[in-house]
């Protein structure tokens, strides 16, 4: 059952899913100048049986200029760099992720994918919070939120996390090193990084190209 609301917003914190529950949908979004192929599904869907979960459908993007063709356009040098970056992030994410029964891992990138990922979560999904760089976590309990359903209405539990303006960021489960983050999150409506239950994710890589950065914020 789809969650029909958004995970709570915690000031100076971001969240992510470690794995995606079966039923989770990911929008097939393409970068500017590209569009989803005509015959392509608008979503990828996390499906599975008792032993294995995986993403159904493959997102495919084609040039907006190229009508009636599914030919994959060769990326320009700057696009290749962006794609390589995304591939690297994906590998790092996979290394981080636990194999949970009934859950899918982060799907690999596709050619000319948009810079944001929009996920649609389902009941039972857990997301984990961490403070952004420059803020320290004061935990009163688990820094996580779970989508639950009561009387046919969905809601996310409130994460027990407060982020105070001090040095080190907190860590997501299973991560040993603090993650790098951009200095502050952009506040303008146009540039804001987004996550909702239609969970938009924008990923970047640090200048060192060594640390996976995961920055998300509400739309």
């Amino acid at each position: 059952e789809l969650c029909d609301d958004d995970p709570p917003k915690i000031t100076h914190a971001t969240f992510k899913a470690v794995a995606y529950k079966e039923g989770t949908m990911l929008n097939c979004e393409c970068k500017r100048g590209f569009r989803r192929i005509k015959s392509g599904s608008p979503y990828m869907l996390c499906t599975g049986n008792s032993s294995h979960s995986s993403w159904d459908n493959q997102c495919q993007c084609t040039s907006s200029a190229a009508r009636n063709t599914t030919k994959q356009v060769t990326p320009q040098p700057e696009e290749q760099k962006e794609r390589k970056t995304t591939e690297m992030q994906s590998q790092m994410q996979l290394a981080d992720q636990v194999s949970l029964p009934g859950h899918c891992r982060e799907p690999p990138p596709w050619e000319n994918e948009a810079t944001e990922r929009i996920y649609h979560f389902v009941v039972g999904q857990t997301v984990y919070y961490q403070c952004v760089q420059g803020y320290r976590a004061l935990h009163r309990g688990p820094a996580e939120s779970v989508c639950k359903m009561t009387h046919g209405k969905t809601r996310w539990t409130q994460p027990q996390l407060i982020c105070t303006g001090e040095t080190e960021p907190s860590q997501f489960p299973g991560e040993e090193e603090p993650q790098a983050s951009p200095d502050g999150l952009p506040e303008s409506e146009t540039s804001r990084l987004v996550t909702t239950t239609d969970f938009r994710i924008q990923t970047e890589v640090a200048a060192t190209m060594e640390t996976f950065i995961f920055t998300t914020e509400y739309q």
Epitope: L2, D4, G23, V123, G152, V194, T196, D198, Q219
Partner: antibody
């Protein structure tokens, strides 16, 4: 009590546009998504899409992606759905319904008739 | 898209009858929801998450099922129950409804 009050019936020419409104009261408007559902004469219900009023994020049924544009105005607690390039087959009753899970509250419906 | 097929499309019954409407989904879904609609009115939530009665709904209504097969039952049809009934899934986008079952007077 929760109420969704929709704008009145409209008669439109083919090729024109129409904007249907849905004014919410009795709850926090930004706490629930607003969905839109279409019902053609004598037909069943079709989900068109929703808007998250607190963020402006919209999700559409692909069938209506090029037909409908859903917006919301927090200041007036009103959701809107604009239908473009109207054709006779767009003649239907359009409902708004409060989300957050099952549709527990519905507007009374707005009949849009497209006729030359 | 998940297709929802209701049967029958029309059901002729009398007051006091036991009425059963089935809804079959083209793929497995987690829950089914049911709405009742009367002519000229908006749909009204009847049953949510397969078997739970919405507020104010009489106990003669019940729902059951799992996977792809779901059922709405009215144990003893009352005059107020003549209406059209729709099943609805919200397990995946696009959200979809059945084509409706009209319960009419025999």
């Amino acid at each position: 009590q929760v109420q969704l009050v929709q704008s009145g019936a409209e008669v439109k020419k083919p090729g024109s546009s129409v904007k249907v409104s849905c004014k919410a009261s009795g709850y926090t408007f930004t706490s629930y998504r607003m969905h839109w559902v279409r019902q053609a004469p004598g037909q069943g219900l079709e989900w068109m899409g929703y808007i998250n009023p607190s963020t402006g994020y919209t999700e559409y049924n692909q069938k209506f992606k090029d037909k409908a544009t859903i917006t919301a105005d927090e200041s007036t607690n009103t959701a809107y759905m604009e239908l473009s390039s109207l054709r006779s087959e767009d003649t239907a009753v359009y409902y708004c319904a409060r989300g957050g899970g099952v549709f527990d509250y519905w507007g009374q419906g707005t009949l849009v008739t497209v006729s030359s | 898209d998940i297709q929802m097929t209701q049967s029958p499309s029309t059901l002729s019954a009398s007051v006091g009858d036991r009425v059963t409407i089935t809804c079959s989904a083209s793929s497995s879904i987690s829950y089914m929801h049911w709405y009742q609609q009367k002519p000229g009115k908006a749909p009204k939530l009847l049953i949510y998450t397969t078997s739970n009665l919405a507020s104010g709904v009489p106990a003669r209504f019940s729902g059951s099922g799992s996977g792809t097969e779901f059922t709405l039952t009215i144990s003893s049809l009352q005059p107020d129950d003549f209406a059209t009934y729709y099943c609805h899934q919200r397990s995946t986008y696009p959200l979809t409804f059945g084509q409706g079952t009209k319960v009419e007077v025999k």
